[in-house]
Interface confidence: low
């Protein structure tokens, strides 16, 4: 059962796991639903009646029963873990708390102008879990304006005291605000041999990366697979770190793989979410339950439905024995993985997919697509809406691409001579424009939010963001698509889709099955030479043949152009303007979306 | 105030001719390339013709090639469209719209409220 709402002067008592120091009980909350085992809290708050080296302390806790006997304690603050809930769950803390001095290693001391330069400082340092600023009120004249980046073994505080004029917060990197880069690779055959801060069971290179990525400290991995000599070693993951926040020496070693923490880049990848299936190998653990079920398939559903469990085993039934079902055992252990991994025993083991929701809706993966032919297919192109206007007679006006649950990214020049957001209709899930009915459910449009530098299209800034008056359900034929990390600026995309009602040629008419076309980026300096008469800034991307042919053209504006990389699909570009259609040596020009991502970032995270 | 109003539609037999016109005003016409858009009843919107904003470059719908001609004149900021040999798959609302060019939505800026035109025997 999930339970948002907090108990105020309320302790459950018993079932401690550990004890963290949060500056607020809705961090505490955060903090627990990323822990692997907790499943409810105590907070408590700053108060007279407390103990001071109490407050801001924050109980993680678990139960068998998911539930704990309940006392009154003033000051005191319980909720439950967000696990038990279905919706979006966020570890991105904006919050800036105010004459909170949140104690850790001060690792760096620098002078900023403001709590937010202090912040993004943080957000860009590699090392950086939360700060603390020195405010120009603050009574030692050497400390003002001071900013102490920090960082501890677990990411929180080690301990949270009240200090006039200072103010605390947390890393943004959570948020997708960092700058860091995007290091996606995993670097066959190489030890990285740097300080281990932890070790894991893994059951291949990929959920060692997803676990550095979201353990505090880890920067970096290496994972030894099951071909790896030393037995006792096989599929055993090391979480790294370094002074530089590289690696200092990297050894030449088969059967071992190395990579980085996806950190700054988590945003557009899956890291919480381990979805694959693991034949012939065994999870040990903490036994929860054994269970009947027919697949693993549906053992792995019975795991994600029980709270508590973290990974499974699944060992199929023998000829005729049970109807046809094998046992499934869930498991769970201190850390949410293994305790041992063993092979050749004939199991089929997973991950739960309860964590799926920690993670962006717009990594999960979609149906696989039909490839040749230009008619898309039903669930294709999730992300892709078809924005209508109703003034003077209702009509396609534009493409535009779910980024959110009440946002539409899409281009500013769309709304030339659109005076109001009243008049316009957003219709998701859209295969055939014959589709829409009078009665057809549409999303209303609340605001329209153009990038106030836009003048017109050729000049650039041709973004603009429609926030939806309801929000969007997700299901297979209505979800985000990712954007682009900001640390992926130097990724070669090579596998790029433009989409849309648009005409199929000049002076054509909008098209009724939404279209297709597979389009290869061009570099600016190319783009460039197509288009002497205007300037290819770097905030805008072209794609398109030499000889023409496949292009956007009217009506496919504002729609995605979209990049699949690393299974994962990310909004490249947004369908702006070019010299004709389809024209030889005149490529179609997109806004490049990942020049826009703070500016999106500002206006949809706003409060 | 932007402003364009369409005149001439009516009901005509198969085989005639009309001509229908669109005033405009509010804005720099001669600075804008124009088209004429039909929605026939229960159809979706259907680019007729365009005319670039010096009166060149006039581009036709196959469906319409032939028998239809656009022009306009900047002195007098309006926009025409002589609809010949007409077919009663010609039947529609025609408005007249500002073009913003090749792929820019199927927005078309300015619109007008439309002109009825009715082909049958």
């Known amino acids: 059962e999930c339970v948002t709402q907090l108990l105020k002067d309320t302790c459950f008592e018993g079932g401690d796991i550990t004890t963290v120091f949060t500056p607020s009980a809705k961090y505490c909350q955060v903090v627990c639903t990323y822990h692997p085992r907790c499943l409810l809290f105590t907070f408590t708050a700053e108060s007279p009646s407390e103990d001071p080296t109490r407050w801001f302390t924050c109980v993680l806790k678990d139960s068998v029963t998911e539930t704990l006997p309940r006392v009154n304690r003033t000051a005191a603050i319980s909720g439950y873990s967000f696990k038990q809930c279905s919706h979006q769950i966020s570890a991105c803390n904006k919050d800036i708390y105010v004459d909170l001095d949140m104690k850790g290693i001060n690792y760096n001391s620098s002078v900023a102008k403001s709590a937010q330069e202090c912040q993004e400082r943080c957000t860009d340092d590699v090392h950086c879990h939360f700060f603390t600023y020195a405010t120009r009120q603050f009574p030692s004249l050497e400390h003002r304006n001071i900013c102490l980046l920090k960082h501890t073994q677990t990411g929180t505080p080690t301990r949270i005291t009240k200090l006039d004029k200072v103010v605390s917060g947390f890393s943004l990197k959570s948020c997708a605000l960092s700058n860091l880069a995007c290091i996606r690779d995993i670097f066959p055959n190489t030890v990285f041999a740097d300080s281990n801060i932890d070790s894991v069971m893994a059951p291949d290179a990929f959920v060692c990366g997803r676990i550095c990525t979201h353990h505090p400290g880890c920067l970096f991995f290496t994972f030894f697979s099951q071909e790896w000599p030393k037995e006792s070693q096989r599929n055993l993951c090391l979480l790294k770190t370094s002074e530089s926040g590289l690696p200092s020496t990297r050894i030449k070693k088969s059967k071992a793989l190395s990579g980085f923490s996806l950190q700054s880049c988590r945003h557009s990848i899956p890291v919480f979410c381990h979805s694959s299936f693991y034949h012939d190998t065994d999870f040990l653990g903490e036994e929860l339950d054994i269970v009947a079920a027919k697949s693993h398939e549906a053992c792995q559903k019975l795991c994600t439905n029980a709270v508590r469990c973290q990974f499974f085993t699944y060992t199929p039934a023998q000829a005729s024995c049970n109807e046809g079902k094998g046992k499934c055992y869930l498991k769970l252990s201190s850390n949410g993985s293994p305790t041992k991994i063993l092979h050749g025993r004939g199991g089929i083991s997973g991950y739960t997919l309860r964590l799926c929701k920690m993670d962006n809706e717009c990594t999960t993966k979609i149906k696989p697509r039909i490839v040749g032919g230009t008619a898309s297919v039903r669930g294709e192109w999730p992300w892709q809406v078809t924005l209508h206007t109703t003034s003077p007679t209702q009509r396609h006006l534009c493409g535009g691409s779910i980024i959110g649950n009440q946002w539409i990214l899409t281009a500013a020049h769309c709304f030339y001579g659109v005076e109001s957001p009243k008049i316009l209709r957003v219709y998701s899930g859209i295969l055939n424009q014959s589709e829409i009915k009078e009665d057809t459910s549409f999303f209303g449009v609340q605001e329209i939010i153009i990038h106030d530098q836009y003048k017109m299209a050729e000049s650039g800034y041709d973004i603009a963001l429609l926030k939806l008056e309801t929000t969007v359900n997700y299901t297979d034929s209505q979800r985000p698509i990712c954007l682009p990390s900001k640390g992926d600026r130097n990724v070669i995309y090579t596998d790029c889709w433009v989409t849309g009602w648009g005409y199929r040629k000049l002076r054509d008419k909008i098209q009724n099955t939404l279209q297709k076309a597979k389009i290869p980026l061009v570099t600016n300096e190319e783009c460039q030479k197509r288009y002497r008469g205007h300037k290819i800034t770097h905030k805008m991307i072209c794609a398109g043949y030499r000889e023409g042919g496949k292009d956007a053209c009217k009506g496919d504006s504002g729609g995605p152009l979209s990049c699949k990389h690393n299974e994962v699909w990310h909004l490249v570009g947004i369908t702006s303007w070019g010299e004709g259609c389809a024209q030889r040596e005149r490529p179609g020009v997109y806004t490049n979306v990942v020049e826009y991502v703070d500016w999106i970032l500002e206006k949809t995270q706003a409060v | 105030q932007v402003q364009l109003q369409e005149s001439g539609g009516g009901l005509v037999q198969p085989g005639g001719s009309l001509r229908l016109s669109c005033a405009a005003s509010g804005f720099t016409f001669s600075n804008y390339d124009m088209s004429w858009v039909r929605q026939a009843p229960g159809k979706g919107l259907e680019g007729v013709s365009g005319i670039n904003s010096g009166g060149g470059h006039p581009h036709y719908a196959d469906s319409v090639k032939g028998r239809f001609t656009i022009s306009r004149d900047n002195a007098k900021n309006t926009l025409y469209l002589q609809m010949n040999s007409l077919k009663t798959e010609d039947t529609a609302v025609y408005f007249c719209?500002?073009?913003?060019?090749?792929?820019?939505?199927?927005?078309?800026?300015?619109w007008g409220q439309g002109t009825q035109v009715t082909v049958s025997s």
């Open positions: 719209a500002t073009d913003e060019g090749e792929r820019y939505g199927e927005d078309f800026g300015y």
